[in-house]
């Protein structure tokens, strides 16, 4: 029986041009974690695999770097980068679980502009 | 318990259009993609896209050149495949599937389209 | 696109046999690939994913390899039940992409 629960950052917000770390951390369960995916909804971002170690997909590689830990850090920001991550964890004997980190991109220009001009 | 419920067998005349519905239960429908894969009689299986209901966002594989048309009804949990100009090699059972993210452990039962003058 | 290059096409064994199948994806898919069984008249059944892990309530004898380029699926001891034809699929990118199959038969 799962009786894990995966733990994310929820829905996190960062600058066009910084960086972001994508955190999933799996609780209640002593189940051996072998591998962990980090997904969009169309591709592969980065597998880290127990025996293998990490695997940044060819796509990424210049802006996608492994960690801290079981997590992803994604550097120089666009705002295509806007949307939802997921965190696959294998583990034996549970099985798979997975936790979803929504990320907005933000122009810093424009977060800039809105917080100098607020209307009171 | 996931289940995904096509309709059913369909025969279409040359440059018609067919709608499929796959009806979902058991999980969250906004929660994963659903899947549409297409098997001609005697081949192996091809993917033709998918719809993620959450927000409505697709994608198709080009092999089908614009005539497939994926679609979610989330007040039914209801996805949907429309195949337009239909021609004799379109003649396949079409699944839906869905699982995690882009590997499938639940399949509907399949619905053979025959495209026939 | 991802090509799947899956081997052989058809192959015969006996109740017992050891039988491997193997895909060569035409990129560096990691670890991400899945392997299905389909029997005639019915939808496929997801026995592996990820190259490696059993899907739940799939048995033991059914176990899958590879990384990189190169997987294979075995079968450790053929059961009259496992008569079906077998696909590889990459599950690194859209577009999908399955191999064209293995058709397994008893001797």
């Known amino acids: 029986m799962m009786t894990g629960t995966i733990e994310t950052t929820g829905n996190i917000s960062a600058e066009k041009g910084g960086s972001i770390i994508l955190q999933c951390h799996l609780s209640s369960t002593t189940a051996q974690v072998t591998q962990v995916n980090w997904e969009q909804q169309d591709q592969l971002l980065a597998i880290c695999n127990a025996d293998l170690g990490w695997h940044i997909s060819p796509s990424f590689k210049d802006r996608v770097a492994p960690g801290p830990g079981l997590g992803l850090t994604l550097q120089s920001l666009t705002v295509n980068d806007t949307g939802e991550y997921f965190c696959i964890y294998h583990t034996y004997p549970d099985g798979t679980y997975t936790g979803r980190i929504f990320l907005e991109v933000l122009e810093s220009s424009v977060a800039e502009h809105g917080a100098r001009f607020q209307i009171p | 318990e996931v289940q995904l419920v096509q309709s059913g067998a369909e025969v279409k005349k040359p440059g018609a259009t067919v709608k499929i519905s796959c009806k979902v239960s058991?999980?969250?429908?906004?929660?994963?993609?659903i899947h549409w894969v297409q098997q001609a009689p005697g081949k192996g299986l091809e993917w033709m896209g998918y719809?993620?209901?959450?927000?409505?966002?697709?994608k198709y594989n080009v092999k089908f050149k614009g005539r497939v048309t994926i679609t979610a009804d989330t007040s039914t949990d209801t996805a949907y495949m429309e195949l337009s100009s239909l021609r004799s090699e379109d003649t396949a059972v079409y699944y839906c599937?869905?699982?995690?993210?882009?590997?499938?452990?639940?399949w509907g039962q399949g619905t053979l389209v025959t495209v026939s003058s | 696109d991802i090509q799947m290059t899956q081997s052989p096409s058809s192959l015969s064994a006996s109740v017992g046999d050891r039988v491997t199948i193997t895909c060569k994806a035409s990129?560096?898919?990691?670890?991400?690939v899945a392997w299905y069984q389909q029997k005639p008249g019915k939808a496929p059944k997801l026995l592996i994913y990820?190259?490696?892990y059993r899907y739940t309530g799939v048995p033991s004898r059914f176990s899958g390899s590879g990384s990189g380029t190169d997987f294979t699926f075995t079968i450790s001891s053929l059961q009259p039940e496992d008569i079906a034809t077998y696909y590889c699929?990459?599950?690194?990118?859209?577009?999908?992409?399955f191999g064209a199959g293995t058709k397994l038969e008893i001797k």
């Open positions: 699929q990459q599950h690194y990118s859209i577009p999908l992409t």
């Open positions: 990129q560096d898919v990691f670890t991400a």
């Open positions: 599937a869905t699982g995690m993210l882009r590997w499938f452990a639940y």
């Open positions: 058991g999980y969250t429908f906004t929660d994963h993609t």
């Open positions: 719809i993620y209901p959450r927000d409505g966002s697709s």
């Open positions: 990820s190259a490696s």
